[in-house]
Interface confidence: low
């Protein structure tokens, strides 16, 4: 028998300094956790103890704090090169800068095989990419060998910016003829490593012959097998055992995200290939792992640009951006318009002629905004003003729901109005007239949203069998303030681009705004 | 295209301040993520790094050298300036300027200008 | 600060031979390295960066190796145009330059 030990990280988002337990910014050093120094620390005292040691990463490095909006990527090939990474898998986030936001700083930088078997380059990008990326890659561990296939949401065009010129094809249509090739080449051991989500990669491991392993990506996925380390609750044991078609027992695994957690799997494979065993868990990086000196230096010596664009402007305002508890909780606020409207340009994506973009949508609870923006400062907004409206280091996820269920949600924003509760709804590409007088549960009597499916844009009544899309802080996709039934209905749920990133990135774009209280919230009865 | 061009003043003396001129086109210090630097290469020697200078005004200069070196720039001339008080003989070099790419290698190089510190 | 040791001042090759430079750093940059070309009169021009990522439009014949501190070009097949010296830099700290390699035909 051979003995494989696969390292993985997934989601990691920019994580690359330790964070609190919530992975947002660390407070307080001593119960802070995960970073790519103290991750470091772990991997090498494993790959010291242990023979056959892979690293790998399923994607989405990219995006998630201050470290991305400056270093655009650079951050990720460097220290993932410093960490040694064996093979990363594409994820959505890759490709949020673009095809050369992928291509300059990760692709042509990375020191290790970046993989996706299911996109496809054509026109005059599939030269220019060409080898940069691969379909697989088979390395060398110990005496043997290991194959690595690996694939990437479909859905990437509607979730990023790949442009116009990379097919995502159906993942398991795409990786059979990659695991059959590696077969053909004698590689008996191999892993699907991929982000597409934990019901993708249990179907991977169901329908693809020959993938032994799968390690995942993009759910942020909590397996455990015993008692949980720290907050997260597991979906199920680690590793997650599938079995295929044509019987075998497949180990599937994800190591939530954030750069938190190390997933840890070891397996035992026989002469020809087989998995006899597999076991293990992923490991909490708190601080009881140090964090590594050398890694550490270096994150200080990178940290440095990021104080000063802090404080560098970003683009003016030159109306007073309210957004304090007092309008925010209780009316349309134009704080709140401004951040819908820069979630809905973060999400255009032209894809189908028939819609002039796929989502229209916005909410955003109110008690989310934490701060407004005086303009008289010679109208300038930096990050670091951004960053105390939008403190919670959150990201702008996109949401399938039915019109049922954002009629239970609007319902939800109102059903205690006047306490200043965090509930009540900011929106865009959305009409909601409220009449107060009525009991709670049954206070909105109008509700129209924006049309996608049209090439002038206008409101229509919600339909409520109809599925939308929708554009949101993750906190209410999880179910935050009271928003049960959001976590509860949602149909799809892809985690977006981090909040303050969102919103800065349409402040440089606009140069100067001036977002007004225009209507979109209104109350039917009453003095409001 | 991508040009940079460097102009000094070709001879000056000891204790003086030696002031030079990068102008360049096919590119903006407006654009997130471009910098400028200064290299220097005394006649027949290696290469020197001196100073750099990003698109958000961020400087960094060589700490060997850092209290004799002022670099800053003019983003709507499209010219980065340094300057380096006091010098002396041993400043006599070739001064190049350069693109900064990525990190800190150096695509694009203007053709140099010699300098001569000389009594 | 790094430095960067070009030990062979000089090297010699014929058309059509191969030849390596080497640069070793005086501590871990890991794979932060460009290579440039500097022939006689003209600036330097870059070949390599990221240690192995040859820069577009730099014949294939230039290949870079390497990581943490030692560090290799070469260049496969030599021509005469390839009269030169060449230089390694280091980008991982401040950025500094090796002492050069100068390469002449025979």
């Known amino acids: 028998a051979w003995e494989l030990t696969i390292l993985h990280t997934n989601d990691v988002h920019s994580r690359l300094e330790q964070t609190s337990e919530d992975s947002s910014k660390c407070v307080n050093a001593s119960r802070c956790m995960g970073g790519v120094a103290r991750l470091f620390t772990k991997v090498q005292q494993i790959r010291r103890a242990e023979p056959n040691v892979l690293l790998l990463d399923a994607g989405d490095q990219y995006q998630g704090t201050i470290w991305f909006t400056v270093y655009k990527g650079a951050e990720v090939a460097h220290f993932m090169n410093a960490l040694r990474y064996d093979a990363m898998a594409l994820g959505n986030h890759e490709f949020d800068n673009g095809v050369e936001g992928l291509i300059e700083p990760l692709l042509k930088e990375a020191k290790f095989p970046i993989l996706s078997a299911n996109i496809k380059a054509k026109g005059p990008l599939a030269s220019q990419i060409s080898g940069l990326y691969l379909p697989y890659k088979v390395l060398p561990v110990g005496d043997e060998v290991v194959g690595i296939v690996g694939y990437t949401s479909k859905e990437t065009p509607f979730l990023s910016n790949p442009g116009t010129n990379l097919v995502f094809e159906d993942e398991i249509t795409a990786l059979q003829p990659e695991v059959d090739k590696l077969k053909t080449l004698n590689v008996n051991k191999i892993i699907a490593l991929g982000h597409s989500g934990f019901e993708m990669d249990k179907l991977i491991a169901q329908k693809v012959r020959g993938v032994d392993v799968v390690v995942g990506g993009h759910s942020n996925t909590f397996l455990y097998t015993g008692n949980p380390p720290s907050k997260e609750v597991p979906a199920g044991k680690y590793p997650f055992i599938v079995t295929s078609d044509d019987g075998r027992k497949v180990p599937v695994v994800q190591a939530y995200a954030f750069g938190k957690y190390l997933g840890y799997l070891k397996i035992e494979f026989d002469e020809r290939g087989n998995v006899i065993s597999s076991h293990g868990n992923p490991i909490l990086l708190n601080s009881s792992i140090p964090e590594d000196p050398s890694i550490k230096a270096d994150i200080n010596k990178w940290r440095i640009k990021l104080d000063n664009y802090s404080t560098q402007e970003l683009g003016k305002t030159i109306v007073y951006l309210d957004g304090s508890s007092q309008s925010c909780r209780f009316r349309e606020c134009n704080m709140g318009n401004l951040i819908c409207d820069a979630m809905i340009n973060n999400n255009l994506r032209h894809t189908d002629e028939m819609f002039w973009n796929h989502v229209s949508m916005c909410i955003l609870n109110g008690g989310g905004i934490r701060s407004p923006i005086d303009e008289r400062n010679n109208g300038t907004i930096t990050w670091e003003n951004l960053a105390a409206v939008l403190p919670f280091g959150g990201t702008f996820d996109l949401v399938q729901l039915k019109g049922s269920t954002l009629k239970k949600a609007f319902e939800h924003s109102v059903h205690r109005y006047g306490q200043s509760t965090g509930e009540f709804l900011q929106v865009g590409g959305i009409h909601v007239v409220y009449d107060l007088s009525r009991k709670p549960g049954d206070r909105v009597v109008k509700l129209d949203v924006l049309c996608t499916k049209c090439r002038v844009p206008s409101y229509d009544p919600l339909k409520m069998d109809e599925v939308y899309k929708v554009i949101l802080p993750n906190f209410l996709a999880n179910g935050g303030d009271g928003f049960q039934m959001i976590k509860d209905e949602l149909l799809r749920h892809d985690s977006g681009d981090q909040d303050i990133n969102v919103v800065s990135t349409y402040i440089s774009k606009m140069k100067v705004i001036y977002p007004a209280v225009e209507g979109r919230i209104k109350f039917s009865t009453g003095s409001h | 295209q991508v040009t940079l061009k460097e102009s000094g003043p070709g001879i000056l003396k000891p204790s003086q301040t030696l002031s030079l001129t990068c102008s360049f086109s096919?590119?903006?210090?407006?654009?997130?993520?471009?910098?400028v630097g200064w290299i220097r290469q005394p006649s027949g020697k290696g290469l020197e790094w001196l100073a750099h200078?990003?698109?958000?005004?961020?400087?960094y200069y060589n700490p060997s050298l850092k209290s004799q070196l002022t670099i800053s720039k003019d983003t709507s001339r499209n010219q980065v300036f340094l300057r380096i008080a006091s010098v002396d003989t041993a400043d006599t070099a070739t001064y190049y300027c350069a693109r900064r790419e990525r990190w800190a290698w150096f695509a694009y190089w203007g053709q140099g200008t010699l300098v001569t510190v000389s009594a | 600060d790094i430095v960067m040791t070009q030990s062979q001042k000089f090297m010699s090759a014929s058309v059509g031979d191969r030849v390596s430079v080497t640069c070793k750093a005086s501590q871990n940059v890991f794979t932060n390295v460009a290579w440039y070309q500097q022939k006689p009169g003209q600036s330097p021009k870059v070949l390599i960066y990221?240690?192995?990522y040859r820069y577009s439009g730099v014949p294939d014949r230039f290949t870079g190796s390497g990581s943490g501190t030692d560090f290799t070009l070469t260049i496969n097949n030599v021509q005469s145009e390839d009269l030169a010296e060449y230089f390694c830099?280091?980008?991982?700290?401040?950025?500094?330059f090796g002492s050069g390699t100068k390469l002449e035909i025979k």
């Open positions: 990221s240690a192995s």
């Open positions: 096919g590119f903006s210090l407006n654009t997130s993520g471009m910098g």
């Open positions: 200078i990003w698109w958000d005004d961020d400087k």
């Open positions: 830099q280091q980008y991982n700290s401040y950025p500094t």
